[in-house]
């Protein structure tokens, strides 16, 4: 007869490991007992369990409650055992020693490999601002056994660098993603992808990029000069800009206070029926935590009874 086992048994942390040991005997041969031991190099054999044809299963105190026989029906020639709830410390060499009648004793070894799936974490880098050079966008760390693979999935152009730290029974891998911040990256996903044999599918952690910027400001509403005449209703100026974080708007009049009746509504300045009092220089001040911008326009309210043309100056300042 001969023993059938596996060279390597691989399980994921917390799963049950089946340690196979089957005696393929000739007709009439019987298995008296199967002794299981852990036999790591440099250490003495440590009893795991004994399966006896008459006495049943004996489990070593060190493994009490963790070793069982596979569920029935059981073949009397099958000396396999289940090691419940495998932990990293269970990884190593195991030996089954089978006593048969009349053929004598046989032994076989296997290696138990316990996969420890990683629990990845993603850490964003410092705040990204337009105009910076190459900057850390995020780092992703995953520790497991064996070492996990850490990659990035994104449309954003950047560079990656990885480093690995080996521990006694695992390895930690950290990958960093660097980029040159630009406003086009705003809202773009940056995904850390962790692969590992202990995972059914890759683990993905997505970070949305936020790049601080503030665009030049401009004012709209004075495109048709003829509309700015005495008595006109619904006249308005709108300040145009964009930024991250979203900017706030403030309107002032350079040559005095805002005329009565003029309404400020965020980026919009609304006028009552126009009078010559509304002529003047108006300033839109745009700001966010990153920067601030100004844009100013000159409003000249015309009297339709006058023949002279309307003069408009547009000045933009930063």
């Amino acid at each position: 007869g001969e023993l059938e086992t596996s060279d390597v048994v691989t399980v994921v942390l917390g799963q049950d490991a089946k340690l196979p040991c089957f005696y393929r005997g000739d007709s009439g041969e019987q298995v008296g007992q199967v002794a299981w031991a852990r036999v790591d190099a440099g250490e003495g054999a440590q009893e795991l369990a004994l399966l006896h044809s008459k006495y049943g299963l004996h489990v070593s105190p060190a493994y009490e409650g963790r070793v069982e026989q596979p569920p029935p029906p059981r073949n009397p020639l099958d000396g396999s055992v289940l090691l419940r709830n495998a932990v990293q410390a269970d990884e190593g060499e195991y030996e089954c020693r089978v006593s048969t009648f009349p053929a004598g004793s046989f032994q076989a070894r296997l290696r138990l490999r316990v996969l420890v799936p990683p629990l990845p974490s993603l850490n964003p880098g410092p705040a990204l601002e337009e105009g910076q050079g190459l900057t850390l966008a995020a780092s992703c760390t995953a520790e497991g056994s064996p070492a996990p693979s850490v990659t990035w999935d994104t449309e954003v152009k950047g560079t990656t660098s990885s480093r690995s730290f080996k521990h006694s029974r695992s390895a930690a891998v950290t990958s960093e993603f660097h980029l040159v911040p630009s406003r086009s990256m705003n809202g773009q996903p940056l995904t850390c992808v962790v692969s590992h044999p202990g995972l059914l599918q890759d683990q993905r952690i997505t970070h949305i990029l936020h790049v601080s910027f503030l665009a030049e400001a401009s004012v709209r509403g004075l495109e048709d000069q003829n509309l700015w005449h005495i008595g006109r209703e619904g006249a308005m100026l709108k300040c145009l800009s964009e930024g991250q974080p979203p900017p706030s708007y403030n309107w002032t009049r350079l040559d005095g206070p805002l005329p009565s009746g003029v309404r400020v509504d965020g980026d919009t300045l609304g006028f009552p029926p126009l009078t010559t009092e509304h002529s003047g220089i108006y300033v839109c001040h745009v700001s966010n935590e990153f920067s601030s911008r100004d844009s100013q326009v000159t409003v000249d309210v015309l009297d339709p009874q006058e023949d002279s043309g309307k003069q408009v100056d547009l000045v933009s300042a930063s």
Epitope: Q33, A35, A37, E47, L50, H52, K54, Y55, G56, L57, H58, S60, P61, R97
Partner: antibody
């Protein structure tokens, strides 16, 4: 036929010492783990000590640990129990018994027993 | 240590009676249980090993059953020579421990 014969029992004062022997015949002595079991007058059976076939890995009941020493001479097919610092509560019939070592620290039931030797500890 | 609890501690029966003695272990011991018979002034004699296996030379009226924590010794038809004290013993762990014994007396 397998025979186990104990000797060395007797009357001893508290604090005294005694050495029990168990001579085995009729089978291969070195194949078996041996143990001592005692029975106080009118009481039940109490395991005292055990020893591997090779003579190592000695085990003791808490009640005798540090006072009793088990040993064997495989060349003489003999088991011993050295008893020191004897107490009145050690008074009992001492039996030697054999069992087969299955693996590690796992044994069969004890299939053969000696007739016993009486140890009396009294002043 | 594993505690072995035997019951009853004594019983009276007549020749031909069916006698049952139970033994409970404080924790699972698979089938690492033996039953011994002891007569006054004599050494214990192995009757049953591995919970249910009959030792060579022991009459078939003796039988054992059970596994784990609960075990039973049955004498199907009590004979005059069966009046004695019976002990169960676990040898799953060291120290091996015995039940307190069951004395079977003539009614």
């Amino acid at each position: 036929e397998v025979q186990l014969v104990e000797s060395g029992g007797g009357l001893v004062q508290p604090g005294g010492s005694l050495r029990l022997s168990c001579a085995a015949s009729g089978d291969i002595f070195t194949n078996y783990s041996m143990s001592w079991v005692r029975q106080a007058p009118g009481k039940g059976l109490e395991w005292v000590s055990g020893i591997y076939p090779s003579g190592d890995n000695n085990r003791y009941a808490d009640s005798v640990k540090g006072r009793f020493t088990i040993s064997r001479d495989n060349s003489k097919n003999t088991l011993y129990l050295q008893m020191n610092s004897l107490r009145a509560e050690d008074t009992a019939v001492y039996y030697c018994a054999r069992a087969e070592l299955l693996a590690f620290d796992v044994y069969t039931a004890s299939d053969y027993w000696g007739q016993g030797t009486l140890v009396t500890v009294s002043s | 240590d594993i505690q072995m609890t035997q019951s009853p501690s004594s019983l009276s029966a007549s020749v031909g009676d069916r006698v049952t003695i139970t033994c409970r272990a404080s924790q699972g011991i698979s089938s690492y249980l033996a039953w011994y018979q002891q007569k006054p002034g004599k050494a214990p004699k192995l009757l049953i090993y591995a919970a249910s296996s009959l030792q060579s030379g022991v009459p078939s009226r003796f039988s054992g059953s059970g596994s784990g924590t609960d075990f039973t010794l049955t004498i199907s038809s009590l004979q005059p020579e069966d009046f004695a004290t019976y002990y169960c013993q676990q040898h799953y762990t060291t120290p091996p421990t015995f039940g307190q014994g069951t004395k079977v007396e003539i009614k």
